[in-house]
């Protein structure tokens, strides 16, 4: 299936040009999306091109500026947040990135009623997290690992926690491992729907081993970065959840929420918190051996002033074939009765589907079914449930939005997006206003992305929010590569692949092949999305064929494929890449003497193992920031898929699956190893150990480090990285510069 045909015709060939590396590095062909910042059923805020904050009312068609760019500029604000009572706006400046989601910033409160900044009892700086209550204008914020509460922006703060300590106790914000591997947020506090209560997590990292690495900076001596980071099998953070009454916090104090007995009996994680009403909260817990999850619904008992989590409101989710959930355990979406909920988990056939839970999980009513997967529940209203899936036309790499009418019986299903812009749009997400009165659809491809606004009742398109016209015009004279998404059937395994072909691709010719791999558990690389990136350039300008293959362990095609890698990381992911390459060679247009593989992070691990597989298929390859041994990576992630590195569990496979164990096999390939020295995620240690093993085996290889760069290798390092990798590949494929 050709998803993005090149617009090359002989008549216009002269005016067309190939992509250049400079195009990619400059972001010349980047696209925009439009996500409304909903503030009611029919109103949203948006930051205009000239940086004014504008309020749009869909029903009246009116818009007005609530905050001028002058005010924004006066404090160098890069972000904002309107209080729900619309009296105040917080302005965020001095953004300073920490880890993937976390950052600190300076916050100013602007009073919209008098057009002045709030003076007196100003917020301290830098703040780690700040948010408005869902109703009114209470503020909760985290400063120096402690949580504070303001009843009004001009009021003095009430300090909720006092034990916060850098790298030791984290209140209201996650530690490194919870941020990266469990919550995927910068915050760990949650307001109840009307702002009566504030729930928060406390993470105690006192006993966690610390990863230390040098940050070279510009000083005479490098400084040492210390992060409590539990690697596989190490001591984990100890988590506790508290809830405080924000109306009179000084009186009752924080109430600790009890952990379900079956969870508390051994090491465990807290995985998420969902408020149902002001007096009902749902907590999700997970055993350290991550195949058992418990969802616990707790009620506030006014007479006791306590949170009661009865055993009858504990719902157990267990996997017997792998780990609980997909990448994370799914979160519940509660219905209007405030006790039943919708949740995605595996059905009896091993496909993730929406289930309705009224009393027990055993009696769950399956809402969706089929040999495809429900991926996200966006919104449940009184009569509709909106979700995304990859059902349409049986392409796992697509996302369409569906509506199920839950108000009628039997429920009817409608695909909202399948036929809207069928060629252009096959991969959607959505953003809903209150009560799903309106929604925005954001289409990511395969054509040029487009964002549109829709009526939540009729699904009618109201207007285009962003259609990337400038990008469309800029691409008119570019020879884009062709892309196709197809599948291979091998030994009862379906391997979906995306192939990116040079613009003048000719099946009778031979092309160098580059495999781009990620391959991590529950990931998906073969997606019907638009991208003009480095591999687009390699196909367009350098005439390479690039292929991405989703093998065993990848997501959204059922548990058989997903859980195939359970406790065996580094085996089937690699096998499936190799199998796919052999199939590509059989297609007849691949030069089998010029095949390379590259990947980043988990992909760096897979590419390294593929190069060291001893097949002789690969001439060269690149590993960027690879994992080299699962003993070096984070406990939460690693143990989910690998169990524990202990003799009585899975130590043997931990040892067998290292890159270092295969050092000898790198002798007959050209290997480029790349890593940032300040990688907080996949530590430089991983590449240092590969390099040591290769040196000890007297195997030649190439390497590049990026001083003081993290896992993302951003900024000028990005340019250097892609330039360096381009040279390496061109040399490997004997392409002239």
């Amino acid at each position: 299936i050709v998803l993005r045909p090149s617009r090359v015709h002989n008549s216009e060939e002269n005016t067309m040009r190939a992509l250049t590396l400079k195009d990619i590095l400059n972001g010349t062909f980047s696209y925009k999306t439009f996500f409304p910042n909903w503030i009611s059923g029919q109103e949203y805020l948006h930051q205009s091109a000239d940086n004014n904050i504008v309020l749009y009312n869909i029903e009246t068609g009116q818009s007005y500026t609530i905050l001028s760019n002058r005010t924004m500029k006066s404090v160098n604000a890069s972000n904002y947040g309107l209080s729900p009572d619309r009296q105040f706006v917080y302005l965020e400046s001095d953004y300073s990135k920490l880890w993937r989601y976390s950052y600190t910033a300076t916050y100013y409160i602007y009073d919209l009623s008098n057009g002045e900044f709030v003076r007196g009892n100003e917020l301290p700086r830098p703040i780690q997290y700040l948010c408005w209550s869902p109703v009114g204008s209470k503020l909760a914020y985290v400063y120096q690992n402690n949580i504070y509460l303001k009843q009004r922006p001009g009021d003095p703060p009430f300090q909720i926690t006092f034990n916060g300590r850098e790298n030791k106790i984290f209140n209201g914000i996650p530690d490194w491992v919870y941020e990266e591997e469990m919550l995927a947020t910068k915050y760990a506090l949650w307001w109840s729907p009307n702002g009566k209560f504030l729930a928060y997590a406390e993470f105690n990292d006192t006993d966690i081993p610390v990863i230390a690495y040098s940050y070279y900076g510009d000083e005479q001596y490098p400084r040492t970065i210390n992060i409590p980071y539990p690697k596989a099998g190490a001591k984990n953070p100890v988590v506790r959840i508290f809830i405080i009454d924000t109306t009179y916090p000084a009186y009752v104090g924080p109430q600790e929420v009890p952990v379900p007995a079956m969870i508390a009996s051994s090491d465990y994680y807290f995985s998420w918190l969902t408020w149902v009403t002001d007096e009902r909260v749902c907590l999700q817990w997970l055993k350290r051996v991550q195949n058992v999850s418990v969802l616990s619904i707790c009620d506030f008992r006014e007479d006791w002033q306590t949170w009661d989590c009865p055993k009858t409101q504990e719902h157990i989710e267990e996997s017997r074939t792998g780990w609980a959930g997909g990448f994370f355990v799914s979160t519940p979406v509660f219905s209007y009765d405030a006790i039943s909920y919708y949740k995605i988990f595996s059905d009896k056939d091993g496909y993730k589907h929406i289930h309705y839970i009224k009393d027990t999980v055993e009696n769950a009513i399956q809402i969706t079914s089929g040999k495809w997967e429900a991926i996200n529940i966006f919104r449940v209203t009184q009569d509709s449930l909106f979700y995304s899936s990859n059902e349409f036309e049986e392409y796992p790499g697509r996302r369409n939005i569906y509506r199920i009418s839950i108000g009628s019986y039997p429920p009817s299903k409608k695909c909202v997006t399948c036929h809207l812009r069928k060629e252009r749009c096959q991969y959607y997400t959505a953003s809903f206003s209150d009560y799903a009165k309106y929604y925005a659809l954001v289409c990511y491809g395969p054509g040029i992305p487009i964002s549109t606004l829709h009526d939540g009742r009729t699904d009618q398109e109201i207007k285009i929010l962003e259609e990337n016209k400038e990008l469309e015009n800029a691409l008119k004279n570019i020879q884009l590569p062709k892309e196709e998404i197809k599948k291979l059937e091998v030994d009862e395994i379906t391997l979906w692949y995306k192939m990116i072909l040079p613009p003048q691709f000719d099946r009778s010719k031979k092309y160098p092949l580059l495999i781009q791999v990620y391959g991590g558990p529950c990931s998906q690389s073969v997606r019907s999305v638009f991208a003009v990136n480095w591999i687009s350039y390699l196909a367009s300008k350098e005439g390479m064929v690039i292929a991405l293959v989703d093998g065993r362990g990848t997501a959204f095609q059922g548990d058989k494929l997903l859980y195939a890698v359970y406790r065996k990381l580094g085996v089937y992911e690699v096998e499936d890449q190799i199998t796919a390459v052999r199939k590509f060679i059989e297609m007849g247009f691949i030069d089998e003497k010029r095949i390379a593989i590259w990947g980043w992070s988990y992909g760096g691990y897979v590419s390294s193992l593929a190069l060291a597989s001893g097949t002789g298929l690969f001439k060269c390859g690149i590993a960027v920031a690879p994992v080299s041994s699962w003993e070096y990576y984070a406990s939460v992630y690693t143990e989910r898929f690998m169990g524990l590195p202990t003799k009585d569990d899975n130590l043997e496979h931990y040892k067998n699956s290292t890159v270092m164990a295969r050092a000898e096999y790198f002798r007959n390939v050209d290997y480029l190893l790349i890593h940032g020295t300040a990688d907080d995620n996949v530590h430089f240690q991983n590449s240092a150990q590969i390099a040591k093993a290769l040196v000890n085996a007297q195997v030649d290889f190439q390497a590049m480090w990026y001083s003081d760069q993290n896992h993302g290798l951003s900024g000028l390092s990005t340019n250097h990285l892609y330039t360096h990798m381009t040279h390496f590949l061109k040399q490997c494929f004997s392409l002239s510069d």
Epitope: A250, G253, Q255
Partner: antibody, heavy 117, light 108 residues
Framework: EVQLLESGGGLVQPGGSLRLSCAAS????????MSWVRQAPGKGLEWVSA????????YYADSVKGRFTISRDNSKNTLYLQMNSLRAEDTAVYYC??????????WGQGTLVTVSS | EIVLTQSPGTLSLSPGERATLSCRAS???????LAWYQQKPGQAPRLLIN???RRATGIPDRFSGSGSGTDFTLTISRLEPEDFAVYYC?????????FGQGTKVEIK
């Protein structure tokens, strides 16, 4: 009816130790934060320490930090204050009170601690 | 720590009169975190005005609390004989919670 009953006070030499108890009844003890407040003879009130319902968080006034330990046994509906390294300035009537940092709506009758050689 | 200064130190009034007791904080507190107590000789303190200017359970409506920021007032609209006692204000916004030094309301 809510009742708080302190015990364990008495005469102790400087450097000595005492353990105060506060037996609670008439409410769900484990749900509520509790505090100790003291009053030196003829003087005003001074907050000493607080503990949340589960016992998981405790706080102390600087004047007693490192010497006093607040704890509770929810199965016995009892609050404790372990006082070590006592000084003359710790002489006071010690009250247990229901509450966290404020709004102490129920108080015990108090127990007198005298630190003297 | 927040210092609470109560004034006057002693207030001499007759039954039936209005009593106005003042409590000034060294930094902003707000009424959400200020409480008032009554203490009679040989007895434990009794909560009068809970945080948020709410009268505690069983407290007659002649007692009322007001104020914001740093200045707070306890008003007893008509003094009854049983109201002659020492009154303390207390803040709970910042650790450590602190009490004022007290105002003694005595019979004139």
């Amino acid at each position: 009816e809510v009742q708080l009953l302190e015990s364990g006070g008495g005469l102790v030499q400087p450097g000595g130790s005492l353990r105060l108890s506060c037996a609670a009844s008439g409410f769900t003890f484990s749900s509520y934060a509790m505090s100790w407040v003291r009053q030196a003879p003829g003087k005003g009130l001074e907050w000493v320490s607080a503990i949340i319902g589960s016992g998981g968080i405790t706080y102390y006034a600087d004047s007693v930090k490192g010497r006093f330990t607040i704890s509770r046994d929810n199965s016995k509906n009892t609050l404790y204050l372990q006082m070590n390294s006592l000084r003359a300035e710790d002489t006071a009537v010690y009250y247990c009170a229901k509450g966290w940092f404020g709004g102490f709506n129920y108080w015990g009758q108090g127990t007198l601690v005298t630190v003297s050689s | 720590e927040i210092v609470l200064t109560q004034s006057p130190g002693t207030l001499s009034l007759s039954p039936g009169e209005r009593a106005t007791l003042s409590c000034r904080a060294s930094q902003s507190v707000t009424s959400s975190y200020l409480a008032w107590y009554q203490q009679k000789p040989g007895q434990a303190p009794r909560l009068l005005i809970n945080v948020g200017s709410r009268r505690a359970t069983g407290i007659p409506d002649r007692f009322s609390g007001s104020g914001s920021g740093t200045d707070f007032t306890l008003t007893i609209s008509r003094l009854e004989p049983e109201d002659f006692a020492v009154y303390y204000c207390q803040q709970g916004i910042m650790l450590p919670p602190t009490f004022g030094q007290g105002t003694k309301v005595e019979i004139k």
